[in-house]
């Protein structure tokens, strides 16, 4: 039994649970997902039993080995996978545990503007970046682009302070998870702050 193996997959993609066995005489191999039997292999008779019908087309054993390939991944395939190799030559089954994380491909992140104030010709606000469908494990980075700056800011919230008369700036939110990355539509400081320009002390959403 080796240490737990962490695997990553993407929705719609495939993942292979690697299995290298030194066991000579294998009676059966049982793959389990979150305590539910998934597949049972009996090498002697060449029997492969897939427990649930819906998994039949998704399960494969590439190259004639016992490593399990799971295709057409869904979000709820995330979880703990466990394989047991049973043999009369072993007192205890040889086991291996895996943890699978399935992530979604990220769509364009959405940007919302917080309360905006315009004092002494300086526009102050926060930009918040988020995924519309609340995807998990997303890391956000902001790029602030302009003649005077090319800066990165970590986190979903970007505080902005832009003075009228300064060169325009462009803000882009970049979202990443382990399987994909995407970016927001660009936001121009001048356009963002235009609404607050008329009333120097205005606050708006």
């Amino acid at each position: 039994s080796g240490p737990v193996k962490e695997l990553v997959g993407s929705v719609g993609g495939a993942v292979t649970f690697p299995l290298k066995s030194k066991v000579k005489q294998v009676d059966s191999i049982v793959w389990t997902f979150n305590t539910t039997p998934l597949v049972t292999i009996q090498p002697e008779g060449g029997t492969i039993i897939v427990t649930q019908n819906r998994n039949r087309e998704r399960v494969d054993f590439p190259d004639g080995g016992y490593s399990l390939k799971l295709s057409k991944l869904k979000k709820n395939d995330s979880g703990i996978y466990y394989v047991g190799i049973y043999s009369s030559s072993l007192q205890q089954p040889s086991t291996q545990e895996y943890v699978l994380h399935v992530y979604e491909h990220l769509s364009k992140p959405k940007v919302t503007m917080g309360l905006q104030s315009n004092k002494n010709g300086t526009c102050v606000t926060n930009l918040t970046c988020c995924m519309e469908h609340g995807e998990e494990d997303v890391i956000y980075t902001w790029k602030a682009l302009g003649q005077a700056a090319n800066e990165s800011h970590n986190g979903s919230i970007l505080p902005i302070s832009w003075r009228w008369g300064e060169s325009d700036m462009t803000f882009i939110c970049v979202a990443r998870n382990p399987v994909s990355r995407n970016f927001s539509s660009p936001i121009l400081a001048r356009k963002l702050c235009e609404g607050a320009a008329d009333d120097p002390d205005s606050s708006m959403v």
Partner: antibody
Framework: EVQLVESGGGLVQPGGSLRLSCAAS????????MSWVRQAPGKGLEWIGE????????NYAPSLKDKFIISRDNAKNSLYLQMNSLRAEDTAVYYC????????????WGQGTLVTVSS | QIVLSQSPAILSASVGDRVTITCKAS??????VAWYQQKPGKVPKLLIY???TRHTGVPDRFSGSGSGTDFTLTISSLQPEDVATYYC?????????FGQGTKVEIK
């Protein structure tokens, strides 16, 4: 020094296969998306595809999806391009490229390796 | 896929001239455009990204502009060392695509 070095190019017959390698050094290879780009003699640049840090996502140019396979080995700091069913029009210099700060534009390129498909 | 059309294909200008290369996208790419310089026999070098941001170490005679479908790379004062082929790239959507290139020569 950040460096990418391609190898494995050469002369191959039409219908043949070839595996290119790209050895990375000077940066944390296991954290970066990586791409392959090719350039036919006297022609422009063509993006082949990219692979994410843990190999769970591979994106290809649709026209090349069925004949090229991108893979990587983070333990060896290496990127690979398996090319199958090669034709004369696949003759090109093949570059591996790293995106700047893991964005989408490439700031580090290998020196390229020439693949010639001819009988 | 998004097609990028560069013009002109070949540009001949004198040292000190202001040079402009255009890149037209077949659909809106926002500002997801990069520009590269490739000198003869060399590998491509990143000049500009996000349409107008100069990469580290790139001389300030190089500038980029544009958004949506129309983009421009400008060399404010052409130098002998700028002889190269220039490519635009879009990274707004898969597959990433490059323009066919503009060859810049000295008269």
């Amino acid at each position: 020094e950040v460096q990418l070095v391609e190898s494995g190019g050469g002369l191959v017959q039409p219908g043949g296969s070839l595996r290119l390698s790209c050895a990375a050094s000077g940066f944390d290879f296991s954290r970066y998306w990586m791409s392959w780009v090719r350039q036919a003699p006297g022609k422009g640049l063509e993006w082949i595809g990219e692979i994410n840090p843990d190999s769970s996502t591979i994106n290809y140019a649709p026209s090349l999806k069925d004949k090229f396979i991108i893979s990587r080995d983070n333990a060896k700091n290496s990127l690979y391009l398996q090319m199958n069913s090669l034709r004369a029009e696949d003759t090109a210099v093949y570059y591996c490229a790293r995106p700047d700060g893991n964005y989408w534009y490439f700031d580090v390129w290998g020196q390229g390796t020439l693949v010639t498909v001819s009988s | 896929q998004i097609v990028l059309s560069q013009s002109p294909a070949i540009l001949s200008a004198s040292v000190g001239d202001r040079v402009t290369i255009t890149c037209k996208a077949s659909q809106d790419v926002g500002i997801a455009v990069a520009w590269y310089q490739q000198k003869p026999g060399k590998v491509p070098k990143l000049l500009i990204y996000w349409a107008s941001t100069r990469h580290t170490g790139v001389p300030d005679r190089f500038s980029g502009s544009g958004s949506g479908t129309d983009f421009t790379l400008t060399i404010s004062s052409l130098q002998p060392e700028d002889v190269a082929t220039y490519y635009c790239q879009q990274y707004s959507s898969y597959p990433y695509t490059f323009g066919q290139g503009t060859k810049v020569e000295i008269k």
